[in-house]
Interface confidence: low
């Protein structure tokens, strides 16, 4: 629909992206040696938005390896049984329960690195991830509420006279749409998809002819995007009067000239009747003049000057309008 409609409008789009939250690791590689475990928070929960298709690395609390007994990753994803990945240091043994997603793995062998990686992040990875480190001093936790972000596809088109539609398709979470300048907007429509993404649609109308370019600004956690479109000028009362003024004036002038010549012809005929000694050439000239005048004013070959003037007037009018912001 959008593509078909966009062909009918002067489509000029640019986008400026403003990206937020740029990389994908929450781990500090240097393992902080904590002599006094009381300094380490026993329970840390982090809300973490991660963009889809990136790689994410989740890490455990910074506990020294020699103090470890067991490392457990607990993964709770929506609509799935809880998955646990366990490593026992004493037996150097790893065990998995209910873990079916091959994209969620240890970064390397747990004895080398206890971090968990998601490679790549998919929309189904929304959920809670928790690392539990068992030590002689007790258990230490680090939990992540992973929120998978999906960048919406943004489209902008003119659907009908001076009405623009901006869509942010399949974003997660829902994007927000605003317009510059503000128009007469219908309530924003939201369409929810089964995978958790949302399509947001905003339709606005601009009545005044002084607005030619409108910008749709889409705000989203993955970054902001702006598209603009030049609305087609519509034949409206004010504009039409301006555009057709040269033709109206031209018509009045022609009618005036034709009327004037017609009057001359009538008075000429009277002269002829009154004075029959008048030369024929004058009569012929008088009779021919209205026709010649008519032909010159209506034949395209003769009409170039006026056409060019009208065209220039029209271009200057449209040009001014298109560059009025």
């Amino acid at each position: 629909e959008g593509a078909a409609q966009s062909n009918n409008s002067l489509m000029l789009q640019t986008s400026k992206e403003n990206h937020t939250l740029a990389s994908n690791s929450l781990c500090m590689d240097e393992k902080q040696i904590t002599q006094n475990h009381s300094k380490v928070l026993a329970e840390v929960n982090i809300s973490w938005p991660v963009q889809m298709a990136r790689n994410a690395v989740l890490c455990c609390p910074p506990i020294e390896f020699r103090n470890l007994i067991v490392i457990t990753w607990e993964i709770i994803l929506r609509g799935q049984p809880s998955c646990t990945k366990t490593y026992r240091k004493d037996t150097n043994e790893t065990k998995e329960t209910n873990c079916t997603d091959e994209r969620i793995t240890w970064v390397s062998t747990p004895d080398q690195n206890s971090d968990l990686q998601i490679h790549p992040v998919a929309i189904t990875h929304d959920g809670y991830y928790r690392c539990i480190m068992a030590t002689p001093d007790g258990n230490f936790h680090r939990g992540y509420h992973l929120q998978v972000l999906v960048t919406p596809e943004v489209t902008l088109f003119e659907s009908r006279n001076r009405t623009a539609v901006c869509k942010a398709v399949a974003g997660k979470p829902a994007a927000q749409i605003s317009w510059i300048p503000a128009g007469d907007c219908a309530p924003t429509e939201q369409e929810y998809w089964g995978n958790g993404t949302v399509t947001v649609k905003s339709t606005c109308h601009w009545e005044g002819h002084n607005v030619s370019t409108v910008t749709c600004h889409v705000s989203h956690l993955t970054g902001n995007k702006s598209l603009y479109i030049e609305l087609l000028p519509v034949p409206g009362a004010k504009k039409s009067a301006k555009l057709y003024m040269p033709y109206v004036i031209l018509t009045i002038i022609i009618l005036t000239i034709v009327g004037f010549i017609w009057l001359l012809k009538i008075s000429g005929c009277r002269k002829y009747n009154l004075n029959k000694t008048e030369s024929t050439s004058v009569v012929e000239e008088d009779e021919m003049q209205p026709y010649a005048s008519y032909t010159e004013k209506n034949n395209p070959l003769y009409d170039t000057t006026n056409k060019v003037k009208a065209s220039q007037a029209l271009q200057s009018e449209v040009g001014t309008d298109l560059h009025t912001l």
């Epitope: 403003n18 990206h19 937020t20 939250l21 740029a22 990389s23 994908n24 690791s25 929450l26 781990c27 500090m28 590689d29 240097e30 809300s47 973490w48 938005p49 991660v50 990136r54 790689n55 690395v57 970064v107 690195n113 990686q117 929120q147 956690l221 970054g223 902001n224």
Partner: antibody, heavy 119, light 112 residues
Framework: QVQLVESGGGVVQPGRSLRLSCVAS????????MHWVRQAPGKGLEWVAI????????YYADSVKGRFTISRDNSKNTLYLQMNSLRAEDTAVYYC????????????WGQGTLVTVSS | DIVMTQSPLSLPVTPGEPASISCRSS???????????LDWYLQKPGQSPQLLIY???NRASGVPDRFSGSGSGTDFTLKISRLEAEDVGVYYC?????????FGQGTKVEIK
Amino acid sequence: QVQLVESGGGVVQPGRSLRLSCVASGFTFSSYGMHWVRQAPGKGLEWVAIIWNDGSNRYYADSVKGRFTISRDNSKNTLYLQMNSLRAEDTAVYYCARDRIVGAGFDYWGQGTLVTVSS
Amino acid sequence: DIVMTQSPLSLPVTPGEPASISCRSSQSLLHSNGYNYLDWYLQKPGQSPQLLIYLGSNRASGVPDRFSGSGSGTDFTLKISRLEAEDVGVYYCMQGLQTPWTFGQGTKVEIK
């Protein structure tokens, strides 16, 4: 321990090019976003560019956009900054820095390499 | 771009006394996840900058507990409870909410 070592700085004429390198060690380089930050003599810090951990995305400061290119080779644990059409205002110490968390701090910085653009 | 404004630009402090630096952003740095994307750095004379505080109030690894960060939205403060000689240098705040990352002008802390 984590180390970042920059190289490639020097004196260069305006309009010429230079390539800076930053070799990383002591951590899993491919897991981290990396930045270039610069500091003109006697001035404050100015962010220059970032590259995603997998190289898929790059962003630049407006002042260098179109002239500088950030890249990385994860197999060599190396970050690069290709600087073209250099200007006098690009004179600065260039630091590479590791992105600690998503948008939350540069936790390790290199020692910096000085780039002087002068005729 | 988000503009970061620090005050004061120069701060002479007596050792053992507290110090406070203010940082203001031109737009809110509070993300919908509840974190403020503001960091504090210290650049000691002749050295590279080092991370002190991330996400508004979290001390980076190895940073002494005399440093603390507070604030939310657009107004942030870095406090040093008792200034030590090794704390002198230029302190910068930086926003990490959106590109381009932007720094404050810096606050030079020196011994009075």
